[in-house]
Structure formats: C-alpha cells, structure tokens
C-alpha cells in the first residue's frame, strides 16, 4: 500500500495503529520535556 499501512488483516492494521499511537505519545512526551528543559 502506498500509504505504508498494512491492511491485509484487520488485526494487523489495528496493531500497527496502536504502535503508531504509542510512538506518537512517547515522542510527544519527549518533545514536551525538551521544551520544558529549555
């Protein structure tokens, strides 16, 4: 798929979305921490 999202199976799609959500939360937290430290 051109958008890089695995859609052959719903459960794999959901797992990938969960990982993306988790990474976004972690990276967002790190970014906020960096801004705070400045």
């Amino acid at each position: 798929h051109s958008d890089g999202i695995f859609t052959d199976s719903y459960s794999r799609y959901r797992k990938q979305m969960a990982v993306k959500k988790y990474l976004a939360a972690v990276l967002g937290k790190r970014y906020k921490q960096r801004v705070k430290n400045k």
């Epitope: 719903y10 459960s11 959901r14 797992k15």
Partner: antibody
C-alpha cells in the same frame, strides 16, 4: 446511551440487490470501526464486513467479497451494507456492531437488534 | 480459515455451580503477545453481548463470575457461581486472522 438501529431488510429474489442501513447514536461514530455480522436461520454467526472509522479501509470474507460493499456516512452517523448478486445462503439476520475501540482488535461491544434479509424466489 | 470448535454443544448446570465452556481453534489465534479471542452471550430474541475480549479481559459491566482463560489454540469460559440469568447461548470468536470466525455456540441451561 449507545444505540444501533438497523433497517432496510426484506425479501429479495436470488441475483437481486438490497441495501441495509444502521443508524448510530450515543457515541462519536467517526472514531469507531464498525462491522456487519449475520446470523443464519441455524443460529450460526458469520462475519460479513468491517470498515475503519474514517471509511478508508474495508475488509470482507471471501464468501461476500465482490458482492457486498460496506460504507459509512459519518455526517449522518450511518453505516451501510450494499448487497448484490444475492444467494439463498445470504438469508440471515444482519447485525451492525461497533468495534470496542481497544487496541485488542475484533471484539464488538455494541450490537443492533438486526434486520432480516430473506433471499428466495 | 480458522475453525473454532466449542464443547459441549449444550450443558445443564445447577444454580450456584460452575459452568465451563471450551473453545478450540484449528490454529493459533495469538499474535505479538495478544490472544485474539472474544466471548459473547446471546439470549433468545436478543443480539450477542460482549463478555470477554483478548481471551481474559472482562468487558465493562460484566459480573466477575464470568472469566476467560487460555492462549494459542485452547480457550475456556468459566461462569461461577452460575445464576438463573446466565441461561443463554455462548459463542467464541477469533479475530487474529481474516476471515473472523465464530464457534458453533454452547447452550447453557440452569437446573
């Protein structure tokens, strides 16, 4: 209160088409993936289709692929199932169901009361 | 397709006793640490009701007398102590692999 109400079922001849709808209320419809599941007269449950919250992705079993199309209108909080080339084995009670929103995929936490589809000549 | 075989097809349990329902999959329904197994309860004239997701997680509002266990290919639904209102048909469902499939159901009667 979460509510799902199906409509549009009826009697259709083999080879015919039918579009059933599911009106959703009581939750942020566009945030939830949705499914159609049918129950045969013998009480067997069959998964029919699933669509993501935004409507970008859909999944079907081979038994209905190319004949059934799941879609949604998030502005109207409505889920659809367009059925064509209907066969006698498609006779069932058709339920719309909400996916539970957890990272655990495939569990359906709210179901409508169903709409009956009979395929017979 | 993954075939789910439920046993027994029906059982009668005395009030207050334990009901045990088995669901065996033709291949593993586990993926990346999760078991994609769900249990539903259905009473006559009603749609299925979610009881347990991810093999052992109780859905909100479901009494603690319901519990689910298992991984891989063998899963169990336990109800203890059984109450009158638990008379229903119970279905397992896997969503690890498309197509999602359901077991044939187990009818529970309360004695």
């Amino acid at each position: 209160d979460v509510k799902l109400v199906e409509s549009g079922g009826g009697l259709v001849k083999p080879g015919g088409s039918l579009k059933v709808s599911c009106a959703a209320s009581g939750f942020a419809f566009n945030n939830y993936d949705m499914s159609w599941v049918r129950q045969t007269p013998e009480k067997r449950l069959d998964w029919v289709a699933t669509i993501t919250g935004g409507g970008s992705y859909t999944w079907y079993p081979d038994s209905v692929k190319g004949r059934f199309t799941i879609s949604r209108d998030n502005a109207r909080n409505t889920l659809f199932l367009q059925m064509s080339s209907l066969r006698s084995e498609d006779t069932a009670l058709y339920y719309c169901a909400r996916l539970n929103g957890y990272d655990q995929a495939g569990a359906m936490d709210y179901w409508g009361q169903g709409t009956s589809v009979t395929v017979s000549s | 397709d993954i075939v789910l075989t439920q046993s027994p097809a029906s059982l009668a349990v005395s009030l207050g006793q334990r009901a045990t329902i088995s669901c065996k999959a033709s291949q593993s329904v586990d993926y990346d640490g999760d078991s994609y197994m769900t249990w539903y309860q259905q009473k006559p004239g009603q749609p299925p009701k979610l009881l347990i997701y991810a093999a052992s997680n109780l859905d909100s509002g479901i009494p603690a007398r319901f519990s689910g266990s298992g991984s891989g290919t063998d899963f169990t639904l336990n109800i203890h102590p059984v109450e009158e209102e638990d008379a229903a048909t119970y279905y397992c469902q896997q969503s690890n692999e498309d197509p999602w499939t359901f077991g044939g159901g187990t009818k529970l009667e309360i004695k």
